[in-house]
């Protein structure tokens, strides 16, 4: 299936050019998406090209500027947030990145009624997180690990917590491991639907071991970065959840929400909080051994001024074949009765599907079914449920949006997106206005991305929000590679792959092959999305074939494939890449003397193990910021898939699955090892240990470090990195510069 046909015609051939590395590094062919910032059922905000904040009313067709670029520029604002009562806007400036999601910033409050910034009781700086209440214009913010509340922007703040301490106690924001591996947010506080209550998490990192690394900077002495970071088997953060009445917080104070007894009996995690009504909240908890999750629905007791979580409202989700959930345990989407909910979890056949839970999980009604997976529930209204899945035409790497009518019986299902722009669009996400009156569809490919606005009742397209015309024009004279997504059937395992082929691909010729691998649990690399990136260039200009393969452990194809890697990371992921390479060789157009593999992060781990597999298949390979031993990585992630590194649990496989244990096997391959010295996520320690093992084994290898760079190797390091890797591969494949 050729998903992105080359635009080469003989008459035009001489005017067309290949992609260059410069194109990629300059982002020449990057695309835009349009996500409306919904503020009601029929209105949204959008930042225009000239930086005005514009309010659009779909029904009247009118738009007007609510905040001028001049006001934005006056405080160098890079972001904004309108209060729900539309009286104020916060302006965010001095953005300073911390970890993946977290950052600090300076906030200014602009009063729309008088066109002036609020003076008096200004916010302190820098703030770690700030948000409006869902109704009105109360503000909650986190400063120096403590939470503050303002009844109005010009009011003085009420301090809710007092125990916040850098690297010790985190209130309303997650610590490193919760941010990266559990919540995937920069915040850990949640307003109730009408702003009556504020729930927040407190993370106590007092007993967590600290990772320390040098940040070289420009000073005479490097400074040391210290992060409480629990590695596999180490002491974990202690989490508590509190809820405070935001109207009169001084009387009752923050009330702790009780942890279910079956969870509290041993180490546990808090995984998410969902408000149902102002007086009902749903908390999800997870045992440290992450195969048991408990969803607990708690009610406010007016007489006690506290939160009651009856055992009858505890719902247990357990996996007997792997860990609970996919990458994360799914979150519930509550229906209008405020007690029943929809949730994605494995059905009896081992496929993740939508279930409706009214009383107990055992009595759950399955809403979707089939040998495919429901991926996300976007919205539940009185009569419809909108979700995404990869059902259509049995391609796991696609995403289409479906609507199930839940108001009628039996419920009927309609694919909203399947036939809209079938060739261009096979991978969608959606963004819904209040009550799903309208929604935006964002198509990511395989063709050029396009964002459209739709009527939530009829699904009719109202207008195109962004169609990337400039990109389309710019690509007209570019020889893009061909892409195909197909599958291999091997020993009852289906291996989906994406192959990126040079523009003038000829099956009778031989091409060098580069495998790009990630391969982490619950990941997916083979997706029907548009991209013009480094591997596009390698195919277009350097004539390489690039392949991405989703092997065992990857997502959205059922639990059999997903949980195959449970407790034995580093085995089947590698085997399946090798199996795929052998199949590719059998196709006849691969030069088997010129095969390479590369990956980043988990992909760096897999590529390293593949190179050290002793198969002789790979001539060379690159590992960027690889994990080298699961004992070095974060507890929450690692233990989910590997259990604990203890003798009575899974220590043996922790030891067997290291890259260092295979140092000898690197002797016959060219290996390029790359890492940032300030990687807070996969610590430089991982590559340092690989290098040490290779030196001790007297194995030659190449290495590159990036001083003061984190896991993303951003900025100028990106250019250097891809230039360096390109030289390495061209040398490996004997391609002239």
């Amino acid at each position: 299936i050729v998903l992105r046909p080359s635009r080469v015609h003989n008459s035009e051939e001489n005017t067309m050019r290949a992609l260059t590395l410069k194109d990629i590094l300059n982002g020449t062919f990057s695309y835009k998406t349009f996500f409306p910032n919904w503020i009601s059922g029929q209105e949204y905000l959008h930042q225009s090209a000239d930086n005005n904040i514009v309010l659009y009313n779909i029904e009247t067709g009118q738009s007007y500027t609510i905040l001028s670029n001049r006001t934005m520029k006056s405080v160098n604002a890079s972001n904004y947030g309108l209060s729900p009562d539309r009286q104020f806007v916060y302006l965010e400036s001095d953005y300073s990145k911390l970890w993946r999601y977290s950052y600090t910033a300076t906030y200014y409050i602009y009063d729309l009624s008088n066109g002036e910034f609020v003076r008096g009781n200004e916010l302190p700086r820098p703030i770690q997180y700030l948000c409006w209440s869902p109704v009105g214009s109360k503000l909650a913010y986190v400063y120096q690990n403590n939470i503050y509340l303002k009844q109005r922007p010009g009011d003085p703040p009420f301090q809710i917590t007092f125990n916040g301490r850098e690297n010790k106690i985190f209130n309303g924001i997650p610590d490193w491991v919760y941010e990266e591996e559990m919540l995937a947010t920069k915040y850990a506080l949640w307003w109730s639907p009408n702003g009556k209550f504020l729930a927040y998490a407190e993370f106590n990192d007092t007993d967590i071991p600290v990772i320390a690394y040098s940040y070289y900077g420009d000073e005479q002495y490097p400074r040391t970065i210290n992060i409480p970071y629990p590695k596999a088997g180490a002491k974990n953060p202690v989490v508590r959840i509190f809820i405070i009445d935001t109207t009169y917080p001084a009387y009752v104070g923050p009330q702790e929400v009780p942890v279910p007894a079956m969870i509290a009996s041993s180490d546990y995690y808090f995984s998410w909080l969902t408000w149902v009504t102002d007086e009902r909240v749903c908390l999800q908890w997870l045992k440290r051994v992450q195969n048991v999750s408990v969803l607990s629905i708690c009610d406010f007791r007016e007489d006690w001024q506290t939160w009651d979580c009856p055992k009858t409202q505890e719902h247990i989700e357990e996996s007997r074949t792997g860990w609970a959930g996919g990458f994360f345990v799914s979150t519930p989407v509550f229906s209008y009765d405020a007690i029943s909910y929809y949730k994605i979890f494995s059905d009896k056949d081992g496929y993740k599907h939508i279930h409706y839970i009214k009383d107990t999980v055992e009595n759950a009604i399955q809403i979707t079914s089939g040998k495919w997976e429901a991926i996300n529930i976007f919205r539940v209204t009185q009569d419809s449920l909108f979700y995404s899945s990869n059902e259509f035409e049995e391609y796991p790497g696609r995403r289409n949006i479906y609507r199930i009518s839940i108001g009628s019986y039996p419920p009927s299902k309609k694919c909203v997106t399947c036939h809209l722009r079938k060739e261009r669009c096979q991978y969608y996400t959606a963004s819904f206005s209040d009550y799903a009156k309208y929604y935006a569809l964002v198509c990511y490919g395989p063709g050029i991305p396009i964002s459209t606005l739709h009527d939530g009742r009829t699904d009719q397209e109202i207008k195109i929000l962004e169609e990337n015309k400039e990109l389309e024009n710019a690509l007209k004279n570019i020889q893009l590679p061909k892409e195909e997504i197909k599958k291999l059937e091997v020993d009852e395992i289906t291996l989906w792959y994406k192959m990126i082929l040079p523009p003038q691909f000829d099956r009778s010729k031989k091409y060098p092959l580069l495998i790009q691998v990630y391969g982490g649990p619950c990941s997916q690399s083979v997706r029907s999305v548009f991209a013009v990136n480094w591997i596009s260039y390698l195919a277009s200009k350097e004539g390489m074939v690039i392949a991405l393969v989703d092997g065992r452990g990857t997502a959205f194809q059922g639990d059999k494939l997903l949980y195959a890697v449970y407790r034995k990371l580093g085995v089947y992921e590698v085997e399946d890449q090798i199996t795929a390479v052998r199949k590719f060789i059998e196709m006849g157009f691969i030069d088997e003397k010129r095969i390479a593999i590369w990956g980043w992060s988990y992909g760096g781990y897999v590529s390293s193990l593949a190179l050290a597999s002793g198969t002789g298949l790979f001539k060379c390979g690159i590992a960027v910021a690889p994990v080298s031993s699961w004992e070095y990585y974060a507890s929450v992630y690692t233990e989910r898939f590997m259990g604990l590194p203890t003798k009575d649990d899974n220590l043996e496989h922790y030891k067997n699955s290291t890259v260092m244990a295979r140092a000898e096997y690197f002797r016959n391959v060219d290996y390029l090892l790359i890492h940032g010295t300030a990687d807070d996520n996969v610590h430089f320690q991982n590559s340092a240990q690989i290098a040490k093992a290779l030196v001790n084994a007297q194995v030659d290898f190449q290495a590159m470090w990036y001083s003061d760079q984190n896991h993303g190797l951003s900025g100028l390091s990106t250019n250097h990195l891809y230039t360096h890797m390109t030289h390495f591969l061209k040398q490996c494949f004997s391609l002239s510069d």
Partner: antibody, heavy 116, light 108 residues
């Protein structure tokens, strides 16, 4: 009906110690924040200390920090204030009050006199 | 800390008269964090008003509170004999919570 009954006051020498108790009834004690507020003879009210329902969080006025310890026993519905290194300026009627930083119910108070 | 200054120190009035008590804060205090208490000789304080203007349970409607920012007022529309007492304002916004020095309402 909410009732708070303080006890344990009395005469103590400077540098001495005293433990005040407050027996609570008429409401669910365990989740409630509780406080101690004092009133020197003929003077105004001064907040002294507060404690969360679980006892996990405690708060003190600077004037007593390091000398006074607030605690509670939820099984006995009782609030305590352990007062060490007492000074003449600690002489006051000590009230037990329900609330964190504002107080909807108060006890009758117990008099603490620090004098040599 | 936030200092609350009450005035007058003493208010001498007859039963049936209107009493107006003032409380001024050294810095702005949101209404939600301002309370008034009544204390009679030998008794514990009693919550009268919370949130600057909301009457606590069982408090007669002759008691009313108003104000915002730094200036707050407690008004007793018609003094009853049992209303002669000391009245304290209290803020719970700043930490630590603080009280005014009190206004004594005495019989003229």
């Amino acid at each position: 009906e909410v009732q708070l009954l303080e006890s344990g006051g009395g005469l103590v020498q400077p540098g001495g110690s005293l433990r005040l108790s407050c027996a609570a009834s008429g409401f669910t004690f365990s989740p409630a924040y509780m406080s101690w507020v004092r009133q020197a003879p003929g003077k105004g009210l001064e907040w002294v200390s507060a404690i969360s329902g679980s006892g996990g969080s405690t708060y003190y006025a600077d004037s007593v920090k390091g000398r006074f310890t607030i605690s509670r026993d939820n099984s006995k519905n009782t609030l305590y204030l352990q007062m060490n290194s007492l000074r003449a300026e600690d002489t006051a009627v000590y009230y037990c009050a329900k609330g964190w930083r504002a107080f909807d119910y108060w006890g009758q108070g117990t008099l603490v006199t620090v004098s040599s | 800390e936030i200092v609350l200054t009450q005035s007058p120190g003493t208010l001498s009035l007859s039963p049936g008269e209107r009493a107006t008590l003032s409380c001024r804060a050294s810095q702005s205090v949101s209404r939600n964090y301002l309370a008034w208490y009544q204390q009679k000789p030998g008794q514990a304080p009693r919550l009268l008003i919370y949130g600057a203007s909301s009457r606590a349970t069982g408090i007669p409607d002759r008691f009313s509170g108003s104000g915002s920012g730094t200036d707050f007022t407690l008004t007793i529309s018609r003094l009853e004999p049992e209303d002669f007492a000391v009245y304290y304002c209290q803020q719970s916004l700043g930490y630590p919570p603080t009280f005014g020095q009190g206004t004594k309402v005495e019989i003229k």
